[in-house]
Amino acid sequence: VPLDPISVSNSSSQIILKWKPPSDPNGNITHYLVFWERQAEDSELFELDYCLKGLKLPSRTWSPPFESEDSQKHNQSEYEDSAGECCSCPKTDSQILKELEESSFRKTFEDYLHNVVFVPRKTSSGTGAEDPRPSRKRRSLGDVGNVTVAVPTVAAFPNTSSTSVPTSPEEHRPFEKVVNKESLVISGLRHFTGYRIELQACNQDTPEERCSVAAYVSARTMPEAKADDIVGPVTHEIFENNVVHLMWQEPKEPNGLIVLYEVSYRRYGDEELHLCVSRKHFALERGCRLRGLSPGNYSVRIRATSLAGNGSWTEPTYFYVTDYLDVPSNIAK
């Protein structure tokens, strides 16, 4: 099994994966296989009303760049508070002894898995016991020294919506063959999206591929700078009883998902007032309604908040509220 896989994101579309070779490989490691899969956001995120008092936005951090070659602190859960990090204590003699035993056990266990559990996959279509799972069609990059061509995942995840994640069968999962190195830059990923990465060490290429048990690691790409901005105009309609219906377009490709909108409005000469609009409420109104407004000139601006934080405020929109008691009831709306 490849050791100590570390995944970090250095941009909104890339994840860097690094690992160490198995401590006691069965034969020579010829290559590594890296698979990656987009993770759906936790369904609980869709259920919560983030406009409720006291409900904090979910902690969703991307996987920050490496601090040092051997640092593993970014392997912690993405929900963990980074302020809780601390240095590791020096190892005791008993710990060192235990690690040696574990290393020995790992070697024996891997031998067992290779010889007993795993049947080598047949690449030919001849008779005999074949792996019942779909064969993983590989884009072979040849035995190029330190060059790895990144395979974009755009085609694997058609952009049908910002929150639904397609489940693709195993043979369609994007993957990469890595030769002569212990790192890979995975490119063409979606911004601020969690990925589950699977890493295998292989000690034979042809005719039968023999690979280790997979090591897994998770990472989230960095946010896209303007992805949470509301694009297009904020429009309004004024109904009777001084109800103003504000409407806007949701960001097309937000960072994760939009959890709420902030509406900031003020009447000329008055203090600014704030309104929180939940996902659910937005779905009902395609915006929100301001009720019981006093007559006067108003300005309003709106910003979206995603899993990654706030987008930019829109340019102000202006409207005028008349005293509806003085207006005929058949005013065009």
Epitope: T163, S164, E240, A283, S329
Partner: antibody, heavy 116, light 108 residues
Framework: EVQLVQSGAEVKKPGESLKISCKGS????????IGWVRQMPGKGLEWMGI????????RYSPSFQGQVTISADKSISTAYLQWSSLKASDTAMYYC?????????WGQGTLVTVSS | SSELTQDPAVSVALGQTVRITCQGD??????ASWYQQKPGQAPVLVIY???NRPSGIPDRFSGSSSGNTASLTITGAQAEDEADYYC???????????FGGGTKLTVL
């Protein structure tokens, strides 16, 4: 393409239970309300109720409150309309539709026939 | 709950303009949406909001609103426009929806 696909026609006896489904695709199912509408033979459209699959918040028309149950399973992008005890007067075409400042698109409809 | 009232039937000569109306108190607070339904088919949204057409709906369809009345206008009616038309709106509370009784449009 945004689509709602409903389950097939049903023939039931009075007193039986029934659950019909409406599967959404091509959009984020949890982000839009789904309404249910009844159309009795030769009659107009009647609004029954609506559900937000994100948290299963549901609102019913007073005419249908207690008569039917609307639910959703967001893991399979499906909304449901169910009866615990059907009556002959429940014979109708039932449509689901996505709310997006108007109901669009609509499912193809599920014909429910209740007859002894 | 609110009620929306529509004329049961309206006819129009081919190529002429026809207006279908919908009345109800909830229309003072919410716009109507309009649906076309042909025999044996599911309804289709033709107008929503102040006067918005979904993609694929011909521009001969338009909507307007004044006071407690919403109108659907078909300018230059075609034979394929013959159908039942329903208006719908949220009720005054905003928590429920209501449909009008429907208007059967005949194109002569």
């Amino acid at each position: 393409e945004v689509q709602l696909v409903q389950s097939g026609a049903e023939v039931k006896k009075p007193g039986e239970s029934l659950k019909i489904s409406c599967k959404g695709s091509g959009y984020s199912f949890t982000s839009y309300w789904i309404g249910w509408v009844r159309q009795m033979p030769g009659k107009g459209l009647e609004w029954m109720g609506i559900i937000y699959p994100g948290d299963s918040d549901t609102r019913y028309s007073p005419s249908f409150q207690g008569q039917v149950t609307i639910s959703a399973d967001k893991s399979i992008s499906t909304a449901y309309l169910q009866w615990s005890s059907l009556k002959a007067s429940d014979t109708a075409m039932y449509y689901c539709a996505r709310w997006d400042a108007g109901y669009s698109p609509w499912g193809q409809g599920t014909l429910v026939t209740v007859s002894s | 709950s609110s009620e929306l009232t529509q004329d049961p039937a309206v006819s129009v000569a081919l190529g002429q303009t026809v207006r279908i109306t919908c009345q109800g108190d909830s229309l003072r607070s919410y716009y109507a949406s309009w649906y076309q339904q042909k025999p044996g088919q599911a309804p289709v949204l033709v107008i929503y909001g102040k006067n918005n057409r979904p993609s694929g709906i011909p521009d001969r369809f338009s909507g307007s609103s004044s006071g407690n009345t919403a109108s659907l206008t078909i300018t230059g009616a075609q034979a394929e426009d013959e159908a039942d038309y329903y208006c719908s709106s949220r009720d005054s509370s905003g928590d429920q929806w209501v449909f009008g009784g429907g208007t059967k449009l005949t194109v002569l």
